[in-house]
Interface confidence: low
């Protein structure tokens, strides 16, 4: 939607223009203005970005296209014919009419739209050759862009892990997105919301059609981003979802408290080689770098497909796996570490936490082993392997003694 | 004039491979969408697989997932299908197809593919 | 998946016939759907996109309607090399995903 900033405009450095796929003077008419108003206008990634004139550095408004629908060319009112210089662009929630100055710059525009919204280049406009090779360009740009694109708000952390951030910092965001467990070329976004006073963890599939991504709801609804992604869920909770932003501060470790074998005692478990943490946030689609120390770790071993079923309740409810299905946010067997505590060793008599909390149990036992990610994992293996192996004792603890 | 010509077609048998090229002329081919459409003996028209432009996004039929691979080189004006562990149900004319804004509008005219034994 | 439903699967008309064939998606896919016409041992042959756009070279005879879940491909007058099969596509999730109806035999009576 096209929205004039309230921020006050800070012009970048001299020189540094700002770099577009295509830019020229455009007209515009938004659904709530009387007449066109005159900008220079530039399309970079998803966004046509409109200045007061082709000297300035900063845009005083910009069109976000992750809900395009179509374009199509406007015979203005009053005309009989089209004079080759008006076109409507028709997003999901609103039409924008555009005028240029010539019919090769309206065709210009549709085919950069076109081309950076389908990832094609469209050949059946009134292009010239030359046209439709500066077009594939942008083309391999934008599918470049795409690839490394990811929300900060995205993790490659598994499921439990995924649960546990959201529970571990609240104050940092209740919504992530993370990899698929299924192993399909897909998101899965997790939430943590109040419910009747209960805190409920929701998880939704986000499959990978082509460059779409479709949120997997009652109504499918499709996105061209994961950026879009993410919108979708906060504009739709009226913002009660908040993107997950791990501040620099926090600890990238995950540690808990385990009974000490021979004396009985609480100790803090922090496993001695930390797994890499996620990136600071910063706001903002930040590149994932494609040869990262992270991705040369030696890849987990991949489970049977389970990472994307959920811990079965006990009782009568059913395994659950997916859309909407809410899951109560337990209170995991785990301490997590105050903030800015320095890491401690493997063994740590009585660190600074509170004491060891009974968990939650859902009336019985877990139905399948908790998964470990096959992606990087967040949190260090061992330790989850340790954290799931002492749940997993606790809970058949306790069924044993309820049957 | 715009032409689309698939080869690679032939027998073969269940478990094998085979690859299938569609050689364009005629067009930008890097400035669209291809695809694999296939139709078995007397059936009717099923969509295999589609590519985009620049070859990074692929898609592809349930029945194939895992088993084919689509590619491109734009270079070389050429779409691939490249065809792993074929079964009796994957026997039919193999078409690549190309999009227009809204449609299909160029077609090849097939090569036969037969899986048996 | 987006399914497409044809009907009829056969029909069998005159020449000079008015001929209706009826397609049906499982969910709403606007207007994004095409017709094609395919002849024994050929490729198909795109008719009508966009659910009524008539592809250039295809007589005006041809002509398509509907939006939503429920289309039409009407041919007012039949002419003899009309015998074809008829295959409805959709064309939903943008470029990539393509659904196609089973098909609809169009005999000589």
């Known amino acids: 939607m096209a929205s004039a900033l309230r921020p006050p405009r800070v012009p970048k450095p001299k020189g540094v223009l700002p770099s577009h796929y295509y830019e020229s003077f455009l007209e515009k008419k938004g659904p709530c203005d009387r007449d066109y108003k005159k900008f220079w206008a530039g399309l970079q990634g998803l966004t046509i970005y409109f200045y007061n004139s082709n000297r300035d550095f900063q845009h005083v408004e910009k069109l976000n296209l992750g809900a395009f629908e179509k374009l199509t060319d406007e015979i203005p009112w009053g005309s009989s014919r089209d004079p080759g210089t008006h076109f409507s662009l028709i997003l999901r929630d609103q039409e924008i009419k555009f005028k240029v100055e010539t019919l090769e710059c309206r065709e210009m525009w549709k085919g950069f739209i076109l081309t950076v919204v389908e990832l094609r280049v469209p050949t059946d406009l009134t292009l010239l050759p030359g046209h439709l090779y500066m077009m594939s360009e942008v083309l391999a740009k934008e599918e470049a862009r795409r690839a490394l694109e990811t929300p900060s708000c995205f993790l490659k952390v598994s499921r439990l892990e995924a649960q546990l951030l959201l529970e571990r910092y609240p104050e940092c965001g209740n919504l992530l997105l993370r990899p698929s467990g299924d192993g399909a070329d897909g998101v899965s976004v997790t939430t943590r919301q109040m419910h009747n006073g209960t805190h409920v963890v929701r998880h939704y599939k986000v499959k990978r059609e082509g460059p779409k991504y479709v949120i997997d709801v009652e109504q499918p609804f499709s996105c061209t981003s994961l950026d879009a992604v993410v919108n979708y869920f906060v504009s739709h909770t009226k913002k009660a979802l908040v993107p997950f932003l791990l501040d620099e501060d926090y600890e990238k470790v995950l540690g808990y408290v385990e009974a000490d074998k021979e004396n009985g005692e609480n100790v803090w478990v922090a496993p001695s080689a930390p797994g890499p943490g996620p990136a600071p946030c910063t706001g903002g689609p930040k590149p994932l770098s494609p040869a990262s120390s992270q991705d040369k770790l030696p890849p987990l071993p991949p489970l049977p497909n389970q990472e994307e079923n959920y811990v079965t309740p006990i009782g009568d409810g059913p395994a659950v796996d997916y859309e909407n299905q809410d899951v109560a946010s337990s209170s995991w067997p785990v301490i997590l570490k105050p903030k800015k505590l320095p890491k401690p060793p493997a063994k740590l008599p009585k660190p600074p936490v509170g004491p060891k909390p009974e968990p939650k149990v859902f009336n019985g036992g877990l139905g399948r082993k908790l998964p470990v990610s096959s992606a990087q994992p967040l949190f260090p293996t061992a330790g989850l392997a340790d954290m799931t192996a002492e749940l997993q004792k606790k809970l058949e603890k306790r069924r044993a003694l309820e049957h | 004039e715009v032409q689309l010509l698939e080869s690679g077609g032939g027998l073969v048998q269940p478990g094998g491979s085979l690859r299938l090229s569609c050689a364009a002329s005629?067009?930008?081919?890097?400035?669209?969408?291809m695809y694999w459409v296939r139709q078995a003996p007397g059936k009717g028209l099923e969509w295999v697989s589609s590519?985009?432009?620049?070859?990074?996004?692929?898609y592809y039929a349930d029945s194939v997932k895992g088993r084919f691979t689509i590619s491109r080189d734009n270079s070389k004006n050429t779409l691939y299908l490249q065809m792993n562990s074929l079964r009796a149900e994957d026997t039919a004319v193999y078409y690549c197809?190309?999009?227009?804004?809204?449609?299909?509008?160029?077609w090849g005219q097939g090569t036969l593919v037969t899986v048996s034994s | 998946d987006i399914q497409m439903t044809q009907s009829p699967s056969s029909l069998s008309a005159s020449v000079g016939d008015r001929v209706t064939i009826t397609c049906r998606a499982s969910?709403?896919?606007?207007?994004?759907l095409n017709w094609y016409q395919q002849k024994p041992g050929k490729a198909p042959k795109l008719l009508i996109y966009?659910?009524?756009s008539l592809q250039s070279g295809v007589p005006s005879r041809f002509s398509g309607s509907g939006s939503g879940t429920d289309f039409t491909l009407t041919i007012s007058s039949l002419q003899p090399e009309d015998f074809a099969t008829y295959y409805c596509?959709?064309?939903?999730?943008?470029?990539?995903?393509?659904?196609f109806g089973q098909g609809t035999k169009l005999e000589i009576k």
């Open positions: 197809a190309r999009v227009g804004y809204d449609t299909m509008d160029y």
């Open positions: 005629g067009f930008t081919f890097y400035g669209g969408s």
């Open positions: 590519i985009s432009s620049g070859g990074s996004y692929t």
């Open positions: 969910q709403s896919i606007s207007s994004y």
């Open positions: 966009a659910a009524s």
């Open positions: 596509q959709q064309r939903w999730y943008w470029w990539y995903l393509f659904t």
